[in-house]
C-alpha cells in the first residue's frame, strides 16, 4: 500500500492563442482499469475545479462539452490541454489522479504547474 | 452555505434494518465523493464507507461490508446508507464526511444518532 | 490496512503553553495526511491537509510537519477554544484509518 506519485512540469507558458499543454505522469501502485484525471487551480489560497475527465485504461479522455479541458492518455501518462485562457487565469493547475478501480483506491496529487498568461498586445490599426 | 445534514437516526433492534440520509448544499454536490464516518460512545472515529461521484464506485470498511450498502441521488442532492442486519456494535453517531479537493474531509455533518438494542 | 498510532493519549497543560502532537503511520502515507480537532457534541473539523496545509480558516498557531510514517501537530500559544481531542488520519488509499485520538486538556 504505497502512496501514488503525480509528476507534472513546474512552469508552462501558455501560447498567444491562451492555449497551454502539460504532461501528468503518476506512478500506479496497482493495475488501475478505471482512472479519474481532475484539474485544480490554486491562486490567492483559493482552490476551484478547472475540469475533471474518468477515463478507462486504454481509452481516451472523455471531458464534458463544455469544458476547456482536452486530453489523452498513454499508459501511466496523460497529456493535458487547457484552452481559452486569459491572463487572469495565471496560477498554479494541480493534476490530481485518483485509481477508482479495482480495489483500492488511491490518490495521488502532483506539486502543480505554474501557468503564465500573457493577454496579446492589440493588432495596431494599419494605414494601409 | 456549504453544509450537510444527517437523519434518519434512531433506536432499532439487532438484526433490523435503518437507512440514514445525509443531504448536501452549497456546493456541487456530483463532484465530490462522500463518506460515512461513525463515532461510538466515548470512542474514536471510524471510517465506514464512501461512494465516488456519479455513484458507481464504493467502498466499505471491513467491518460493515456485506450489510451496509452506500448510495447517492445527485438529482436530489443526497447520500445515504442502507443499514442490515445490526448489531450492537454499530452503535454510533453516523456523520457524512466530504472528500474535499486534495482528498481529507473538509466538511462533516453534525450526524445521526443509530443505537442498536434490544 | 495503514495503522495510525498517536501519542500521547492525554496531554495536560496551561493555556498559552505550546502542544505538541504525534502520529506515526505503520507504514509510509507519503504527505497524505490530515488532521481533526474535535470538541464535545461538535463533528470533527479539518485542521491541517497533506501533513502541512491548513485549512481554510485554521488560525496560524496550528502547523504541521513530517511526511513517510511519523508527523507532529503543533498548537502554540494554546487558547481556551483549543482543548479538546484531535485525530490524524491517511486518505492517500483505501481504507481510510484514524489515530485513536490525543485529548489535550487545561492542567
Known amino acids: 500500500c504505497k502512496a501514488m506519485h503525480v509528476a507534472q512540469p513546474a512552469v508552462v507558458l501558455a501560447s498567444s492563442r491562451g492555449i497551454a499543454s502539460f504532461v501528468c505522469e503518476y506512478a500506479s501502485p496497482g493495475k488501475a482499469t478505471e482512472v479519474r484525471v481532475t484539474v485544480l487551480r490554486q491562486a490567492d489560497s483559493q482552490v476551484t475545479e478547472v475540469c475533471a475527465a474518468t477515463y478507462m485504461m486504454g481509452n481516451e479522455l472523455t471531458f464534458l462539452d463544455d469544458s476547456i479541458c482536452t486530453g489523452t492518455s498513454s499508459g501511466n501518462q496523460v497529456n493535458l490541454t487547457i484552452q481559452g485562457l486569459r491572463a487572469m487565469d495565471t496560477g498554479l493547475y494541480i493534476c490530481k489522479v485518483e485509481l477508482m478501480y479495482p480495489p483500492p483506491y488511491y490518490l495521488g496529487i502532483g506539486n502543480g504547474t505554474q501557468i503564465y498568461v500573457i493577454d496579446p498586445e492589440p493588432c495596431p490599426d494599419s494605414d494601409f | 452555505q456549504v453544509q450537510l445534514v444527517e437523519s434518519g437516526g434512531g433506536v432499532v433492534q439487532p438484526g433490523r434494518s435503518l437507512r440514514l440520509s445525509c443531504a448536501a448544499s452549497g456546493f456541487t454536490f456530483s463532484s465530490y465523493g462522500i463518506h460515512w464516518v461513525r463515532q461510538a460512545p466515548g470512542k474514536g472515529l471510524e471510517w465506514v464507507a464512501v461512494?465516488?461521484?456519479?455513484?458507481?464506485?464504493?467502498y466499505y470498511a471491513d467491518s460493515v461490508k456485506g450489510r451496509f450498502t452506500i448510495s447517492r441521488d445527485n438529482s436530489k442532492n443526497t447520500l445515504y446508507l442502507q443499514m442490515n442486519s445490526l448489531r450492537a456494535e454499530d452503535t454510533a453517531l453516523y456523520h457524512c464526511?466530504?472528500?474535499?479537493?486534495?482528498?481529507?474531509?473538509?466538511?462533516w455533518g453534525q450526524g445521526t444518532m443509530v443505537t442498536v438494542s434490544s | 490496512e495503514i495503522v495510525l498510532t498517536q501519542s500521547p493519549g492525554t496531554l495536560s497543560l496551561s493555556p498559552g503553553e505550546r502542544a505538541t502532537l504525534s502520529c506515526r503511520a505503520s507504514?509510509?502515507?507519503?504527505?497524505?495526511l490530515a488532521w481533526y480537532q474535535q470538541k464535545p457534541g461538535q463533528a470533527p473539523r479539518l485542521l491541517i491537509y497533506?501533513?502541512?496545509s491548513r485549512a481554510t480558516g485554521i488560525p496560524d498557531r496550528f502547523s504541521g510537519s513530517g511526511s513517510g510514517t511519523d508527523f507532529i501537530l503543533t498548537i502554540n500559544r494554546l487558547e481556551p477554544e483549543d482543548f479538546a481531542v484531535y485525530y490524524c488520519q491517511h486518505y492517500g488509499n483505501s481504507p481510510w484509518t484514524f489515530g485513536q485520538g490525543t485529548k489535550v486538556e487545561i492542567k
Open positions: 507504514q509510509s502515507v507519503s504527505s497524505y
Open positions: 464526511a466530504r472528500s474535499g479537493n486534495f482528498g481529507a474531509f473538509d466538511i
Open positions: 497533506g501533513a502541512s
Open positions: 461512494i465516488w461521484y456519479g455513484g458507481n464506485n464504493k
